[in-house]
Every structure is written in C-alpha cells, then in structure tokens.
Interface confidence: low
C-alpha cells in the first residue's frame, strides 16, 4: 500500500509512527506532532478538508449518484503510544499514517505485531468505534478546528485527540472481525460484507461504504504475551471528492490501493 505525500502527524513524532523508549515501565505518551509543518501548513490541510467536504455537500445536492461514485475515503492512521517492553510482550503497530482511496474501492488498514514468545495462535481483533466528534462537520469550520487545536496546545495537552478519546458509552462500538490461525470471523454487523483480515493482522475492505468512517482498533491477544502495547488504532474517514482533489492533495492516487 503506498503512502501519500500529505503527512499527518503521528504519536511519538517519528516518521514511521513509533518511537522506542528505553525505560519501558515509565514511558509516557508523547504529543501528536506536525513534523516539518508550521501552523500555516496545518491550516492549509484543514482548508483542503473543508473544500472536500464542501464538494460533498454540493455534489449530494445536485448529483447524488455521481457524488457517491466519486467519493473519496481518507484514512488517517494514527499510532497509539509504543514502548519497548520486557520479555514476553506483544507490540502492535499501525503503520502508514495517511491514505486516500475511492469509495467502493478496497482499502487496507495495516496492522503489524511483534511477539517475544511463540504463542499458540494469538487472536487478532479489529474493533470499530464511532468518532467522538463529527470530523466532517468540523471540516466545514476550519477556524474553529484551528482554535480548538491552539487551545489544546495552550492547555499543555497537544497529544489529545478529540475525535478518538472519549468513553465507549457515548459512542458506537462494534467488533469488525477476529482472526485466529487461518480462520477469520466477521462481527454480526459486518456479516455479508467483503471484509477480512489478511496476512496476520491487516484489515481489508474489498469495498468501502459511507458508514465505515470511524476509529478502528487493532489488538492482538495471547495468553503467553501479557505485557506490552497490544493495541493501536487507525482513523478512517469517508469524504466527497471534488474535481480538484488531485491539486488539493499532493500524492493523491486516484485508483485502487492493493492490500
């Protein structure tokens, strides 16, 4: 799967979305960073989102079918805090921070894991959680989003993600799929969908849908590997495509992305 040119910050500040902390038991989350990008770049990125969202609303008003066909899926892949762990630990990594694909085309949320022992068939679990805030609605008001981010910076909590961090009781939570050994089982809500876990832990949608927007958590469970960071998440956002999307988003690839 190719990585697009528009870089979104990842936790721990490293380009691959993870950083090794030498003192695992005491390691703490690091802020979400815009590496090499100043506030103007961030505002330009938010404006591009708003333009795309605006295109979606206009398209639905005039040509709803065409808007559906030409919709774009934006995937922000954000890595949970990653630390080195002592022996007998699982480390789960969601890589590739940002991808763009066309709606109804396949998308893969890559998830990798490392184990320090050899478990008997670790279980891979992908869960869906709806956004805590409406990302698309916020895209219509880039200034408010900017103000919100500035407020967070001022509050000394730049790593806070208002779209992801909230209690499960106030959002929808579903099991998408689980994999143990060679067998993949889809959650009840996703029965009939062409979704699977490929390789060891990548979540693959043969066709994306509007309702797929949300946060996807990849977790790996093993009775023999109890410590470490066994979960990472990816944000999947479905937006409308405007005719100028290629100019708005450097590195945009208008075609299916392979698993």
């Amino acid at each position: 799967m190719q990585q697009d040119g528009l870089g979104v910050g990842t936790r721990n500040g490293s380009g691959k979305g993870r950083s090794v902390h030498p003192s695992w038991p005491w390691c703490a989350p690091r802020p979400l960073r815009y590496f090499g990008r100043d506030a103007r770049a961030r505002r330009a990125q938010t404006a591009a989102m708003a333009l795309l969202a605006g295109g979606l609303s206009r398209g639905l008003g005039s040509h709803p079918a065409a808007a559906g066909r030409d919709a774009v899926v934006f995937v922000w892949l954000l890595l949970s805090t990653w630390c080195t762990a002592p022996a007998r630990a699982i480390q789960v990594t969601v890589s590739n921070p940002y991808h763009v694909v066309i709606l109804f085309q396949p998308v893969t949320l890559p998830c990798t894991y490392q184990m320090t022992s050899t478990p008997t068939q670790p279980i891979v679990i992908w869960k869906y959680k709806s956004f805590c805030r409406d990302r698309i609605a916020d895209a219509f008001s880039p200034a408010s989003v900017d103000n919100q981010l500035n407020a967070q910076l001022a509050a000394g909590n730049p790593g806070y993600n208002p779209y992801v961090e909230c209690q499960d009781s106030v959002r929808t939570v579903r099991v998408v799929a689980t994999k143990q050994g060679n067998a993949v089982t889809l959650g009840d809500y996703y029965q009939g969908r062409r979704i699977t876990i490929t390789g060891n832990a990548d979540l693959t949608f043969d066709q994306t849908a509007w309702g797929d927007s949300g946060v996807y958590y990849c977790s790996v469970v093993s009775a023999q590997d109890l410590q470490g960071n066994n979960e990472a998440y990816a944000e999947l956002i479905v937006l409308g495509r405007t005719s100028g999307v290629a100019e708005l988003l450097p590195g945009f690839q208008a075609g299916p992305i392979e698993d």
Epitope: T108, Q121, N182, A183, I195, T196, N200, T204, D206
Partner: antibody
C-alpha cells in the same frame, strides 16, 4: 469435513492457456486465504499463487508472474487459476490449498504441457 | 527457499526431529507449516501449521516448535507409516515458500 476438489487439468499445448478451478466445501470459504501450489514430476512443492479471503489481495510466484491470474467467487466457494502462455516447465500436479499457512490440500489435478 | 535436511532415518519407536530455516519474517514473526507426502504425485497432508498447531485428524505424536527463525517438526515414537517426504512451508510479504523436502526413512 474440509474438501477441495480441483479440475481443469489435462494435456495442454505450449503457448496456450489453462484454467483450473477448485471447488471448496466443509468450511467458511470467505474466511480463508486460498493458494495454488504445484509439483513438477520428481520435484518438490512450488508455490504458484495466493488470494486473500475477500479476494482483494493476490500474490504470484516468480515463475508465473505476469502469466497467471488467481480469482475467487465466494458465493460459489470456488477459486480459479488462469495460466497463459504455457511452457513445458508448467507441467506438474496443481494443488488447491487452504490458508496462508496451508492446513488443507486438494487431491490435485495433473497438467501436461506438450 | 527454505532450508531443510535432505534425509533422516530412524527406527520404529524413536524420536525424529526435522528442522527448517529461512522462513519469512512476516509482520514481525516467523510462521511455518509441515506437510507430509507419502508418494510422488499423491496429495500432501498438513501435519502442523502455524508453527505448532496440529489438525484434528493428525496423530498426537506429531508436534511442531519454533525457536527464532528455525522450526522443528518432532515425531515422537515414529511408526512405519510415517515414512514419507516432509516439506516445510512458510511465507513472507510477497510469496509462499517451501523447502525441498526431507525424506524420512523408517
């Protein structure tokens, strides 16, 4: 019980095309990756191609890259291997197999390119 | 390709170990499977998959283990009917992999 039944083998002409079909039963077909593996007479096993459970990801061995197409129909629980521009070295028994790390095999179908 | 010995021999009742190395480090872990072929042209039978998982119809004398990037198939109390060629299998991010096969003579 898991069963994998291959068909479509036989005598083939060099330069021609081959279409092998594997019919699966006894398990949730769409939940499993599927593979084609072949064995030339007197030789070892050679991985040919694989396809993910939903069908969106395909992989091919270097010997057939550019000549082979693997596809699947989850509604019919079938996986197909299309091999074009046949060569003498494509001769062998072709097996359909289940899983990324194979845990079940078909009985095989013999292909002779001559 | 995967590396495994060309042949091993044992007397009935003995314990046999066949090793395999060179598997792909796929998603940070090495995974292997083991397949038994009793005669050329006959269908292989999987005796171990995912390093140490044994299909329900395979006798318990077959077991698998992995240390680092090397996998081992162990047959405890080998029997005459275990005489066969054993292939190890693995995969990496782009391809399936097989060893050349180990001929077990009992």
């Amino acid at each position: 019980a898991v069963t994998l039944d291959e068909s479509g083998g036989g005598l083939q002409t060099p330069g021609g095309a081959l279409s092998l079909v594997c019919e699966a039963s006894g398990f949730d077909f769409s939940s499993h990756e599927m593979q084609w593996v072949r064995q030339a007479p007197g030789k070892g096993l050679e991985w040919v191609a694989g396809i993910s459970g939903a069908g969106s990801s395909t992989r091919y061995g270097s010997a057939v890259q550019g000549r082979a197409t693997i596809s699947r129909d989850n509604g019919q629980s079938t996986v197909r291997l299309q091999l074009n521009n046949l060569r003498a070295e494509d001769t062998g028994t072709y097996y359909c197999a289940r899983g990324s790390l194979i845990d079940a095999w078909g009985h095989g179908t013999e292909v002779i390119v001559s | 390709a995967l590396t495994q010995p060309a042949s091993v021999s044992a007397n009935p009742g003995e314990t046999v170990k066949i090793t395999c190395s060179g598997g792909g480090s796929y998603y940070g872990s090495y995974y292997y499977s083991w397949h038994q072929q009793k005669s050329p042209g006959s269908a292989p039978v999987t005796v171990i998959y995912e390093n140490n998982q044994r299909p329900s119809d395979i006798p318990s004398r077959f077991s698998g283990s992995k240390s680092g990037s090397t996998a081992t198939l162990t047959i405890t109390g080998v029997q005459a009917e275990d005489e066969a060629v054993y292939f190890c299998g693995s995969y990496d991010s782009s391809a399936g992999l097989f060893g050349a096969g180990t001929t077990l003579t009992v």
